[in-house]
């Protein structure tokens, strides 16, 4: 999905009312210096590209986050938010269902997170230049 | 240009009713998601209730459930909030605010309905004053 055409203002707004209040909780007794950020984005539509990549792939060590609240109102904002977004989700979602797991907070699904909280970070400041 | 413009405020006593409504000029309602929000002093805006005009999906706020009824008629402008039962904790100002993407995600829409800073545009607002 090419994220050029999101409102982006209204999924900044999105994150900071609620977003990133469950990314908080998630990672709650995790120090904030625990994690070093390897994943970084140039600008806002690459930045919900690796937003949407890390939320919904599983990875090793980390099967999946989608049932995650945070990632619950990352999709419904990607959504509503991003024309035609939810079209094509359709055959990821069913494909999601046949694989799903039961929830498992893993270290390594923490430092997943604390990857995500700083894409987001830098999504929302988009005039910011890369280091 | 677009406007919003509430009416139906005013003073009532514990237990009584009054019915806000919403009217918009400049833009259609049409597939908007339209909130009624309300702000008393020293106080954060909250959102209260909320209509998708496209499937006419409703949302409301805890405190409101049951006794809070928002609508829109055929022409799905205006829109009315019918407040029954009111306590004098429901003083407060009312707005209406619509949004455009919103209304057509109705179902997506249940994490985000409540929060003031992702609506487009705002009605002036009208009081509402609940005696004891």
């Known amino acids: 999905y090419d994220f050029t055409n999101c409102d982006f203002e209204k999924i900044k707004a999105a994150y900071l009312s609620t977003i990133s209040k469950d990314l908080i909780t998630y990672m709650s007794g995790t120090k904030s210096t625990e994690f070093n950020n390897t994943v970084s984005c140039s600008n806002r539509p690459h930045c919900l590209t690796e937003i949407q990549s890390l939320t919904f792939n599983p990875t090793a060590g980390c099967a999946s986050l989608a049932k995650e609240m945070f990632a619950m109102k990352t999709k419904a904002a990607l959504a509503i938010w991003c024309p035609g977004y939810s079209e094509t989700q359709i055959n990821a979602t069913q494909a999601m269902k046949k694989r799903r797991k039961r929830k498992v907070t893993t270290n390594k699904c923490l430092e997943q997170v604390s990857q995500l909280q700083g894409l987001w970070r830098r999504f929302n400041r988009p005039l910011l230049k890369q280091q | 240009q677009v406007q919003l413009v509430e009416s139906g405020g005013g003073l009532v006593q514990a237990g009584g009713s009054l019915r806000l409504s919403c009217a918009a000029s400049g833009f259609t309602f049409d597939d908007y998601a339209i909130t009624w929000f309300r702000q008393a002093p020293g106080k954060e805006r909250e959102g209260v209730a909320y209509i998708s005009n496209n499937d006419g999906m409703t949302y409301y706020a805890d405190s409101v459930k049951g006794r809070f009824t928002i609508s829109s008629d055929n022409a799905k402008n205006p829109v009315y909030l019918q407040m029954d039962s009111l306590k004098p904790e429901d003083t407060a100002v009312y707005y209406c605010?619509?949004?455009?993407?919103?209304?057509?995600?109705?179902?997506?829409?249940?994490?985000?309905?409540?929060?003031?800073?992702?609506?487009?545009?705002w009605g002036q607002g009208t009081q509402v004053t609940v005696s004891s």
């Open positions: 605010a619509a949004e455009g993407r919103m209304g057509t995600h109705s179902r997506d829409s249940v994490y985000f309905w409540a929060f003031s800073a992702l609506y487009d545009y």
